[in-house]
Protein backbone atom coordinates (compact mmCIF):
# COMPACT_ATOMS: atom_id res chain seq x y z
CA UNK A 1 0.00 0.00 0.00
CA UNK A 2 0.97 3.65 -0.36
CA UNK A 3 0.03 6.98 1.19
CA UNK A 4 -1.09 9.82 -1.06
CA UNK A 5 -1.24 13.46 -0.06
CA UNK A 6 -3.94 15.13 -2.20
CA UNK A 7 -2.46 18.54 -1.38
CA UNK A 8 1.19 19.38 -0.84
CA UNK A 9 0.66 22.97 0.31
CA UNK A 10 -2.02 24.63 2.42
CA UNK A 11 -1.95 28.45 2.67
CA UNK A 12 -4.31 29.77 5.33
CA UNK A 13 -5.04 33.02 7.14
CA UNK A 14 -4.65 33.28 10.90
CA UNK A 15 -7.75 32.22 12.82
CA UNK A 16 -8.95 29.81 10.15
CA UNK A 17 -9.50 26.08 10.62
CA UNK A 18 -7.83 23.62 8.27
CA UNK A 19 -8.02 19.87 7.67
CA UNK A 20 -4.82 18.23 6.43
CA UNK A 21 -5.53 14.98 4.58
CA UNK A 22 -3.77 11.76 3.63
CA UNK A 23 -5.17 8.81 1.75
CA UNK A 24 -4.30 5.15 2.00
CA UNK A 25 -3.91 3.71 -1.51
CA UNK A 26 -3.53 0.24 -2.93
CA UNK A 27 -4.81 -3.11 -1.72
CA UNK A 28 -5.71 -2.95 1.95
CA UNK A 29 -5.96 -6.35 3.60
CA UNK A 30 -9.05 -6.48 5.82
CA UNK A 31 -8.00 -9.71 7.50
CA UNK A 32 -7.96 -10.21 11.25
CA UNK A 33 -4.19 -10.41 11.31
CA UNK A 34 -3.68 -6.91 9.85
CA UNK A 35 -4.08 -3.63 11.69
CA UNK A 36 -3.13 -0.09 10.82
CA UNK A 37 -1.57 2.48 13.09
CA UNK A 38 -2.01 6.02 11.78
CA UNK A 39 -0.71 9.22 13.29
CA UNK A 40 0.43 12.79 12.64
CA UNK A 41 3.45 14.84 13.63
CA UNK A 42 5.48 17.86 12.59
CA UNK A 43 8.86 17.44 10.98
CA UNK A 44 11.49 19.13 8.89
CA UNK A 45 12.72 18.61 5.36
CA UNK A 46 15.81 16.61 6.22
CA UNK A 47 18.74 16.30 3.88
CA UNK A 48 18.38 12.52 3.87
CA UNK A 49 14.69 11.87 4.43
CA UNK A 50 11.63 14.06 4.89
CA UNK A 51 9.45 13.17 7.89
CA UNK A 52 12.28 11.34 9.65
CA UNK A 53 12.16 13.58 12.70
CA UNK A 54 9.01 13.49 14.83
CA UNK A 55 8.06 16.75 16.53
CA UNK A 56 4.86 17.53 18.45
CA UNK A 57 1.87 19.34 16.98
CA UNK A 58 0.78 21.99 19.51
CA UNK A 59 2.57 20.06 22.26
CA UNK A 60 0.83 16.79 21.36
CA UNK A 61 3.14 13.97 20.31
CA UNK A 62 2.50 11.42 17.58
CA UNK A 63 1.59 9.05 20.42
CA UNK A 64 -1.22 11.38 21.50
CA UNK A 65 -2.62 11.79 17.99
CA UNK A 66 -2.68 8.20 16.83
CA UNK A 67 -5.51 6.17 15.36
CA UNK A 68 -5.45 2.40 15.64
CA UNK A 69 -7.77 0.00 13.87
CA UNK A 70 -8.08 -2.71 11.27
CA UNK A 71 -8.36 -2.16 7.51
CA UNK A 72 -10.71 0.62 6.38
CA UNK A 73 -12.47 1.05 9.71
CA UNK A 74 -13.34 4.53 10.94
CA UNK A 75 -11.64 5.91 14.03
CA UNK A 76 -11.09 9.10 16.00
CA UNK A 77 -8.47 10.23 18.48
CA UNK A 78 -9.32 10.51 22.16
CA UNK A 79 -11.27 13.76 21.97
CA UNK A 80 -10.54 15.40 25.29
CA UNK A 81 -6.77 15.84 25.08
CA UNK A 82 -6.66 16.71 21.39
CA UNK A 83 -9.64 19.02 21.42
CA UNK A 84 -8.20 21.01 24.30
CA UNK A 85 -5.39 21.84 21.87
CA UNK A 86 -7.77 22.56 18.98
CA UNK A 87 -6.88 19.32 17.21
CA UNK A 88 -8.74 16.27 16.01
CA UNK A 89 -7.52 13.39 13.89
CA UNK A 90 -9.97 11.09 12.16
CA UNK A 91 -10.16 8.22 9.69
CA UNK A 92 -13.00 7.07 7.45
CA UNK A 93 -13.98 3.81 5.71
CA UNK A 94 -12.36 4.79 2.43
CA UNK A 95 -8.74 5.06 3.51
CA UNK A 96 -8.82 8.82 4.10
CA UNK A 97 -7.41 10.13 7.35
CA UNK A 98 -6.93 13.67 8.49
CA UNK A 99 -6.03 16.10 11.20
CA UNK A 100 -8.12 19.21 11.78
CA UNK A 101 -6.43 22.23 13.35
CA UNK A 102 -8.64 24.98 14.69
CA UNK A 103 -7.93 28.70 15.06
CA UNK A 104 -4.59 28.68 13.25
CA UNK A 105 -1.72 30.88 14.39
CA UNK A 106 1.59 31.74 12.72
CA UNK A 107 3.25 29.17 15.00
CA UNK A 108 1.35 26.40 13.20
CA UNK A 109 3.30 27.00 9.98
CA UNK A 110 5.60 24.15 8.99
CA UNK A 111 5.89 20.65 7.58
CA UNK A 112 3.28 18.09 8.65
CA UNK A 113 3.59 14.34 8.23
CA UNK A 114 1.07 11.55 8.29
CA UNK A 115 2.41 8.11 9.15
CA UNK A 116 0.83 4.72 8.51
CA UNK A 117 2.26 1.53 9.97
CA UNK A 118 0.82 -1.75 8.74
CA UNK A 119 1.09 -4.42 11.40
CA UNK A 120 0.79 -7.90 9.93
CA UNK A 121 0.97 -10.92 12.20
CA UNK A 122 4.48 -12.46 12.22
CA UNK A 123 5.74 -10.05 9.57
CA UNK A 124 7.92 -6.97 9.78
CA UNK A 125 6.07 -3.66 10.00
CA UNK A 126 5.52 -1.69 6.82
CA UNK A 127 5.86 2.07 7.33
CA UNK A 128 4.84 4.78 4.87
CA UNK A 129 4.41 8.51 5.30
CA UNK A 130 3.17 11.58 3.48
CA UNK A 131 4.30 15.19 3.84
CA UNK A 132 2.59 18.54 3.34
CA UNK A 133 3.40 22.15 4.08
CA UNK A 134 1.15 24.51 6.02
CA UNK A 135 1.73 28.25 5.67
CA UNK A 136 -0.27 30.47 8.00
CA UNK A 137 -0.27 34.09 6.88
CA UNK A 138 -1.34 37.35 8.42
CA UNK A 139 -1.80 40.87 7.14
CA UNK A 140 -2.84 42.18 3.77
CA UNK A 141 -1.09 39.44 1.81
CA UNK A 142 -2.99 36.68 3.57
CA UNK A 143 -5.79 34.92 1.66
CA UNK A 144 -9.31 35.34 3.01
CA UNK A 145 -9.69 31.56 3.20
CA UNK A 146 -7.41 28.54 2.98
CA UNK A 147 -6.00 27.85 -0.47
CA UNK A 148 -4.69 24.37 -1.21
CA UNK A 149 -2.24 23.31 -3.90
CA UNK A 150 -2.59 19.78 -5.31
CA UNK A 151 0.44 17.55 -5.16
CA UNK A 152 0.26 16.59 -8.84
CA UNK A 153 -0.19 20.00 -10.48
CA UNK A 154 0.14 23.71 -9.85
CA UNK A 155 -3.60 24.32 -9.87
CA UNK A 156 -4.81 25.81 -6.61
CA UNK A 157 -8.16 25.28 -4.99
CA UNK A 158 -10.03 27.52 -2.56
CA UNK A 159 -11.48 25.44 0.26
CA UNK A 160 -13.74 28.05 1.84
CA UNK A 161 -16.74 25.76 1.72
CA UNK A 162 -15.10 23.13 3.91
CA UNK A 163 -13.30 25.25 6.50
CA UNK A 164 -14.89 28.00 8.53
CA UNK A 165 -13.50 30.51 10.97
CA UNK A 166 -13.22 29.44 14.56
CA UNK A 167 -15.84 31.22 16.64
CA UNK A 168 -15.08 31.96 20.27
Amino acid sequence: FKVATPYSLYVCPEGQNVTLTCRLLGPVDKGHDVTFYKTWYRSSRGEVQTCSERRPIRNLTFQDLHLHHGGHQAANTSHDLAQRHGLESASDHHGNFSITMRNLTLLDSGLYCCLVVEIRHHHSEHRVHGAMELQVQTGKDAPSNCVVYPSSSQESENITAHHHHHHH
Epitope: T35, Y37, Q63, S78, I119, H121, H122, E125
Partner: antibody
Framework: QVQLVESGGGLVKPGGSLRLSCAAS????????MSWIRQAPGKGLEWVSY????????YYADSVKGRFTISRDNAKNSLYLQMNSLRAEDTAVYYC???????????WGRGTLVTVSS | EIVLTQSPATLSLSPGERATLSCRAS??????LAWYQQKPGQAPRLLIY???NRATGIPARFSASGSGTDFTLTISSLEPEDFAVYYC?????????FGQGTKVEIK
Protein backbone atom coordinates in the same frame (compact mmCIF):
# COMPACT_ATOMS: atom_id res chain seq x y z
CA GLN B 1 3.99 11.07 36.59
CA VAL B 2 4.62 8.86 33.56
CA GLN B 3 6.15 5.64 34.85
CA LEU B 4 6.31 1.85 34.80
CA VAL B 5 6.93 -0.15 37.96
CA GLU B 6 7.76 -3.86 37.88
CA SER B 7 7.22 -6.28 40.74
CA GLY B 8 7.11 -10.02 41.42
CA GLY B 9 10.76 -10.91 41.05
CA GLY B 10 12.62 -13.12 43.51
CA LEU B 11 14.50 -16.36 44.05
CA VAL B 12 13.01 -19.49 42.51
CA LYS B 13 14.26 -23.04 41.98
CA PRO B 14 14.85 -24.45 38.48
CA GLY B 15 11.56 -25.74 37.09
CA GLY B 16 9.61 -23.29 39.24
CA SER B 17 7.24 -20.52 38.28
CA LEU B 18 6.97 -16.79 38.85
CA ARG B 19 4.55 -14.07 37.76
CA LEU B 20 5.87 -10.60 37.08
CA SER B 21 3.67 -7.51 37.06
CA CYS B 22 4.18 -4.06 35.59
CA ALA B 23 2.01 -1.17 36.77
CA ALA B 24 1.66 1.76 34.38
CA SER B 25 0.69 5.29 35.34
CA UNK B 26 0.64 8.79 33.87
CA UNK B 27 -0.31 7.75 30.32
CA UNK B 28 -3.13 5.96 28.50
CA UNK B 29 -1.93 2.40 28.93
CA UNK B 30 -4.54 0.95 26.55
CA UNK B 31 -3.03 2.97 23.67
CA UNK B 32 0.36 1.31 23.94
CA UNK B 33 1.93 -1.94 22.90
CA MET B 34 4.21 -3.30 25.62
CA SER B 35 7.28 -5.51 25.82
CA TRP B 36 9.31 -7.39 28.39
CA ILE B 37 13.08 -7.12 28.03
CA ARG B 38 15.63 -8.83 30.25
CA GLN B 39 19.26 -8.36 31.18
CA ALA B 40 21.34 -11.15 32.70
CA PRO B 41 23.84 -9.95 35.35
CA GLY B 42 26.69 -8.10 33.63
CA LYS B 43 25.26 -8.90 30.18
CA GLY B 44 23.39 -7.13 27.40
CA LEU B 45 19.70 -6.60 26.72
CA GLU B 46 17.45 -9.34 25.34
CA TRP B 47 13.90 -8.75 24.14
CA VAL B 48 11.57 -11.38 25.61
CA SER B 49 7.97 -10.76 24.62
CA TYR B 50 5.56 -8.25 23.07
CA UNK B 51 1.82 -7.66 23.27
CA UNK B 52 -0.35 -5.27 21.29
CA UNK B 53 -2.62 -2.72 22.93
CA UNK B 54 -5.66 -4.96 22.45
CA UNK B 55 -3.90 -8.14 23.62
CA UNK B 56 -3.29 -9.65 20.18
CA UNK B 57 -0.94 -10.18 18.41
CA UNK B 58 1.62 -11.52 20.85
CA TYR B 59 5.24 -12.45 20.12
CA TYR B 60 7.92 -14.32 22.07
CA ALA B 61 11.65 -14.80 21.75
CA ASP B 62 12.52 -18.40 20.82
CA SER B 63 14.36 -18.79 24.13
CA VAL B 64 11.11 -18.45 26.14
CA LYS B 65 8.46 -19.72 23.71
CA GLY B 66 6.19 -22.29 25.31
CA ARG B 67 7.35 -21.40 28.84
CA PHE B 68 6.44 -17.71 29.24
CA THR B 69 3.05 -16.07 28.75
CA ILE B 70 2.52 -12.33 28.37
CA SER B 71 -0.85 -10.74 29.15
CA ARG B 72 -2.35 -7.40 30.08
CA ASP B 73 -5.34 -5.92 31.87
CA ASN B 74 -6.08 -2.49 30.42
CA ALA B 75 -8.71 -1.81 33.08
CA LYS B 76 -5.99 -2.18 35.73
CA ASN B 77 -3.23 -0.50 33.68
CA SER B 78 -1.15 -3.62 34.17
CA LEU B 79 1.13 -5.88 32.18
CA TYR B 80 2.07 -9.42 33.26
CA LEU B 81 4.62 -12.11 32.47
CA GLN B 82 3.87 -15.63 33.66
CA MET B 83 7.14 -17.58 33.72
CA ASN B 84 7.03 -21.38 33.99
CA SER B 85 9.69 -24.09 33.78
CA LEU B 86 12.33 -21.59 34.80
CA ARG B 87 15.98 -22.28 34.06
CA ALA B 88 19.23 -20.90 35.44
CA GLU B 89 19.71 -18.97 32.19
CA ASP B 90 16.49 -17.05 32.86
CA THR B 91 18.23 -15.28 35.74
CA ALA B 92 18.08 -11.59 34.88
CA VAL B 93 16.62 -8.20 35.64
CA TYR B 94 13.29 -8.04 33.83
CA TYR B 95 12.14 -4.69 32.47
CA CYS B 96 8.76 -3.76 31.07
CA UNK B 97 8.91 -1.15 28.33
CA UNK B 98 6.44 0.92 26.38
CA UNK B 99 6.28 0.30 22.64
CA UNK B 100 4.33 1.47 19.60
CA UNK B 101 4.16 0.45 15.96
CA UNK B 102 6.98 2.09 14.03
CA UNK B 103 8.57 3.27 17.26
CA UNK B 104 11.01 2.18 19.96
CA UNK B 105 11.16 1.50 23.69
CA UNK B 106 10.69 5.06 24.93
CA UNK B 107 9.76 4.34 28.55
CA TRP B 108 11.22 1.64 30.79
CA GLY B 109 10.58 0.50 34.34
CA ARG B 110 13.39 0.16 36.88
CA GLY B 111 13.32 -3.61 36.56
CA THR B 112 12.76 -6.56 38.88
CA LEU B 113 15.40 -9.23 39.54
CA VAL B 114 14.58 -12.88 38.92
CA THR B 115 17.11 -15.40 40.24
CA VAL B 116 16.77 -19.06 39.27
CA SER B 117 18.99 -21.19 41.46
CA SER B 118 18.87 -24.37 43.48
CA GLU C 1 17.33 -13.29 13.42
CA ILE C 2 19.19 -10.07 12.75
CA VAL C 3 22.46 -9.93 14.67
CA LEU C 4 23.77 -6.50 15.68
CA THR C 5 27.51 -6.30 16.34
CA GLN C 6 28.82 -3.31 18.25
CA SER C 7 32.40 -2.12 18.30
CA PRO C 8 34.52 -1.51 20.15
CA ALA C 9 33.42 -3.44 23.23
CA THR C 10 35.03 -0.80 25.44
CA LEU C 11 36.07 2.76 24.69
CA SER C 12 38.43 4.46 27.17
CA LEU C 13 38.31 8.23 26.78
CA SER C 14 38.67 11.44 28.78
CA PRO C 15 35.98 14.08 29.30
CA GLY C 16 35.94 16.48 26.37
CA GLU C 17 37.07 13.85 23.88
CA ARG C 18 35.02 12.61 20.93
CA ALA C 19 33.47 9.14 21.09
CA THR C 20 32.57 7.16 17.98
CA LEU C 21 30.58 3.95 18.42
CA SER C 22 29.71 1.50 15.66
CA CYS C 23 26.81 -0.90 15.14
CA ARG C 24 26.73 -3.35 12.23
CA ALA C 25 23.68 -5.43 11.27
CA SER C 26 23.89 -8.91 9.75
CA UNK C 27 21.32 -7.81 7.16
CA UNK C 28 19.68 -4.52 6.25
CA UNK C 29 17.47 -2.90 8.88
CA UNK C 30 16.77 0.14 6.67
CA UNK C 31 16.82 3.11 9.06
CA UNK C 32 14.85 1.29 11.76
CA LEU C 33 17.55 1.44 14.40
CA ALA C 34 17.73 3.06 17.82
CA TRP C 35 20.49 3.81 20.31
CA TYR C 36 20.06 3.57 24.09
CA GLN C 37 22.20 4.69 27.00
CA GLN C 38 22.35 2.68 30.22
CA LYS C 39 24.04 3.73 33.44
CA PRO C 40 24.80 1.28 36.27
CA GLY C 41 21.69 0.29 38.21
CA GLN C 42 19.39 2.15 35.83
CA ALA C 43 17.08 1.22 32.99
CA PRO C 44 18.13 2.08 29.43
CA ARG C 45 17.11 5.44 27.99
CA LEU C 46 16.20 6.07 24.35
CA LEU C 47 18.77 8.41 22.79
CA ILE C 48 18.33 8.11 19.02
CA TYR C 49 15.46 6.82 16.90
CA UNK C 50 15.29 5.91 13.22
CA UNK C 51 19.09 5.91 12.93
CA UNK C 52 19.69 9.64 13.17
CA ASN C 53 17.07 11.51 15.20
CA ARG C 54 17.59 12.62 18.79
CA ALA C 55 14.83 11.64 21.19
CA THR C 56 13.16 14.32 23.29
CA GLY C 57 15.53 15.99 25.74
CA ILE C 58 18.73 14.45 24.35
CA PRO C 59 21.60 16.98 24.11
CA ALA C 60 22.94 18.07 20.72
CA ARG C 61 26.37 16.55 21.44
CA PHE C 62 24.79 13.18 20.59
CA SER C 63 24.46 12.54 16.87
CA ALA C 64 24.03 9.43 14.78
CA SER C 65 24.02 8.33 11.19
CA GLY C 66 23.78 5.30 8.95
CA SER C 67 21.29 3.13 7.11
CA GLY C 68 21.13 -0.43 5.88
CA THR C 69 23.78 -2.33 7.82
CA ASP C 70 26.25 0.27 9.14
CA PHE C 71 25.44 2.76 11.87
CA THR C 72 27.43 5.20 13.98
CA LEU C 73 26.74 7.03 17.23
CA THR C 74 28.95 10.04 17.95
CA ILE C 75 29.33 11.99 21.17
CA SER C 76 31.12 15.17 20.09
CA SER C 77 32.57 16.11 23.49
CA LEU C 78 32.17 13.69 26.39
CA GLU C 79 30.60 15.02 29.57
CA PRO C 80 31.08 13.18 32.89
CA GLU C 81 27.47 11.93 32.74
CA ASP C 82 28.03 10.32 29.31
CA PHE C 83 30.19 7.50 30.66
CA ALA C 84 27.84 4.53 30.37
CA VAL C 85 26.99 1.52 28.20
CA TYR C 86 25.41 2.17 24.79
CA TYR C 87 23.21 -0.32 22.94
CA CYS C 88 21.84 -0.30 19.41
CA UNK C 89 18.51 -2.01 18.66
CA UNK C 90 16.64 -2.83 15.46
CA UNK C 91 12.90 -3.06 14.88
CA UNK C 92 12.90 -3.94 11.21
CA UNK C 93 12.24 -7.64 11.88
CA UNK C 94 11.11 -10.06 14.54
CA UNK C 95 12.58 -10.71 16.95
CA UNK C 96 13.63 -7.27 18.13
CA UNK C 97 17.36 -7.52 18.75
CA PHE C 98 19.99 -5.48 20.56
CA GLY C 99 23.72 -5.20 20.07
CA GLN C 100 25.93 -6.51 22.86
CA GLY C 101 26.79 -2.97 23.97
CA THR C 102 29.76 -0.61 24.02
CA LYS C 103 31.04 0.59 27.36
CA VAL C 104 32.37 4.15 27.34
CA GLU C 105 34.64 4.43 30.36
CA ILE C 106 36.82 7.18 31.83
CA LYS C 107 40.45 6.86 30.80
Amino acid sequence: QVQLVESGGGLVKPGGSLRLSCAASGFTFSDYYMSWIRQAPGKGLEWVSYISNSGSPIYYADSVKGRFTISRDNAKNSLYLQMNSLRAEDTAVYYCARDLPGWYFDLWGRGTLVTVSS
Amino acid sequence: EIVLTQSPATLSLSPGERATLSCRASQSVSSYLAWYQQKPGQAPRLLIYDASNRATGIPARFSASGSGTDFTLTISSLEPEDFAVYYCQQRNNWPRTFGQGTKVEIK
